[in-house]
């Protein structure tokens, strides 16, 4: 890997923090949406869990050089119900396939200014990012 | 909030990187076990999508508190099959409920030590973390 | 004001289960973990386990896995401590307290800084 | 688990004088300390965390001070409210573990 430059003004320790938060979730670089075709929605009998599932995902990468983790993915689900455990290719309208979100902790690599507003290094700034991890196979919520 | 130490030594820009690279990934303090309780074995139709899913799980806190995060959270199937769609209680053997793991980036807090090997503030070392998102439901693996 | 309100006092009987609940108010109830400590009568105080009512994932002491569920209800605000197959020795004051996270930022400490009123459960054949 | 170990398990002494209780961990934990006061018939109060931080609200004449295993909790001054048990609670590691508690009376 390169390295990335620090986080400190050039004297003594450091005024700014190593880490300025903010825990506003930062949304992903597009909507995780759902991405049906009926041609890959099966589950498959080897491979990966993700197409094993009876909710099968792809994943969708989304990088940001000035991120860490620089490279992250997005599921996104291939069927809208779940495949059924018998044929592992008709849908079964009783499940849903829906998305897992997770709001993972990711840091930003932004410009640090030193006293005199001059540019001195980077900090790392940490927010919440949405990702969705998978698709899961569910009961459809049934309204009290 | 109270600023902790950087990871800069105290003159100068830094010799020690910011953060530190590896790649090994680290194992979860315990082993992502199954923990099958037939009181909760079965599948909702509200709640949350861990207590609705067909390969329903529950989420176990894991905290080191010299790693960002601080907390993570490790899925435990409460399910060794998937929950029936119909019933959302009854197990269907032809679906085996499996862990998804995924290698999580996390930050070690490391003492960093200055030219002449004094202590000066905090270094972040960047590692894989292995972690278990979720259980998902999944045709049994054919062998060929 | 941080307010934490338990149920009342119960009498089981071995081999039973209680349910002990801890209503929250004046904070954000999914912000902050809630633990459950124990103490029996003249005895020191016991931590049985704890619960982010965020995302329901929970920690127990080990003594207790298996007996004990944590749950919570966040639209009432409300966290619960279930403790299955009562014994004897499960006579105690259970109380709930929510877990605040203190600078310096980010790597938080963690103190239980608001407790509940108790629960005094009995457990007598 | 990390065993907590408090002394003296309870202690008399007079208003005014400097009380000290001291808190030893199995392992190091740190600074991952904290302290609490418990009067009779109601719940543990939150008095210190990370070893010598004063929670809002808690008089200057409780402090804590130690590193690594030994820890230690001073009362200054004691005063007629403060007749209670104190409990150290380590949480450097889950499961987090109390001391078994000081008790302190008045003489």
């Known amino acids: 890997y390169s390295h990335w430059p620090s986080c400190c003004p050039s004297k003594g320790y450091p005024s700014e923090e190593l880490l300025r938060w903010s825990t506003v979730p930062v949304p992903p670089l597009k909507p995780a949406s759902l991405d049906f075709h009926s041609v890959s929605c099966r589950a498959s009998e080897d491979g990966p869990l993700n197409s094993r599932a009876i909710s099968p995902w792809r994943y969708e990468l989304d990088r940001d050089l000035n991120r860490l983790p620089q490279d992250l993915y997005h599921a996104r689900c291939l069927c809208p119900h779940c495949v059924s455990l018998q044929t592992g290719s008709h849908m079964d309208p009783r499940g849903n396939s829906e998305l897992l979100y997770h709001n993972q902790t990711v840091f930003y690599r932004r410009p640090c200014h030193g006293k005199k507003g001059n540019h001195k290094g980077y900090c790392l700034e940490r927010r919440l990012y949405r990702v969705s991890l998978a698709c899961v196979c569910v009961r459809p919520r049934v309204m009290g | 909030y109270s600023h902790w130490p950087s990871c800069c030594p105290s003159k100068g820009y830094p010799s020690e990187e910011l953060l530190r690279w590896s790649t090994v990934p680290v194992p979860p303090l315990k082993p992502a076990s199954l923990d099958f309780h037939s009181v909760s074995c079965r599948a909702s139709e509200d709640g949350p999508l861990n207590s609705r899913a067909i390969s329903p799980w529950r989420y176990e806190l894991d905290r080191d508190l010299n790693r960002l995060p601080q907390d993570l959270y490790h899925a435990r199937c409460l399910c060794p099959h998937c929950v029936s769609l119909q019933t959302g209680s009854h197990m269907d053997p032809r679906g085996n409920s499996e862990l998804l793991y995924h290698n999580q980036t996390v930050f070690y807090r490391r003492p960093c030590h200055g030219k002449k090997g004094n202590h000066k503030g905090y270094c972040l070392e960047r590692r894989l973390y292995r972690v278990s998102l979720a259980c998902v439901c999944v045709r049994p693996r054919v062998m060929g | 004001q941080v307010q934490l309100v338990q149920s009342g006092a119960e009498v089981k009987k071995p081999g039973a289960s209680v349910k002990v609940s801890c209503k929250a108010s004046?904070?954000?109830?999914?912000?902050?973990?809630m633990n459950w400590v124990r103490q029996a009568p003249g005895q020191g105080l016991e931590w049985m386990g704890l619960?982010?009512?965020?995302?329901?994932?929970?920690s127990y002491k080990q003594k207790f896995q298996g007996r004990v569920t944590m749950t919570v209800d966040k639209s009432i605000s409300t966290a619960y401590m279930e403790l299955s197959r009562l014994r004897s020795d499960d006579t105690a004051v259970y109380y709930c307290?929510?877990?605040?996270?203190?600078?310096?930022?980010?790597?938080?400490?963690?103190?239980?800084?608001?407790w509940g009123q108790g629960t005094l459960v009995t457990v007598s054949s | 688990d990390i065993q907590m170990t408090q002394s003296p398990s309870s202690l008399s002494a007079s208003v005014g004088d400097r009380v000290t209780i001291t808190c030893q961990a199995s392992?190091?934990?740190?600074?991952?300390l904290n302290w609490y006061q418990q009067k009779p018939g109601k719940a543990p109060k939150l008095l210190i965390y990370?070893?010598?931080t004063l929670h809002t609200g808690v008089p200057s004449r409780f402090s804590g001070s130690g590193s690594g295993t030994d820890y230690t909790f001073t009362i200054s001054s004691l005063q007629p409210e403060d007749i209670a048990t104190y409990y150290c609670?380590?949480?450097?590691?889950?499961?987090?573990?109390f001391g078994q508690g000081t008790k302190l009376e008045i003489k």
């Open positions: 004046g904070y954000s109830f999914t912000g902050y973990t």
């Open positions: 307290a929510r877990e605040g996270y203190y600078g310096p930022s980010p790597f938080h400490h963690y103190a239980m800084d608001y």
């Open positions: 990370y070893t010598s």
């Open positions: 392992q190091d934990i740190s600074n991952y």
């Open positions: 619960i982010n009512p965020d995302n329901g994932g929970t």
């Open positions: 609670q380590q949480y450097s590691k889950l499961p987090y573990t």
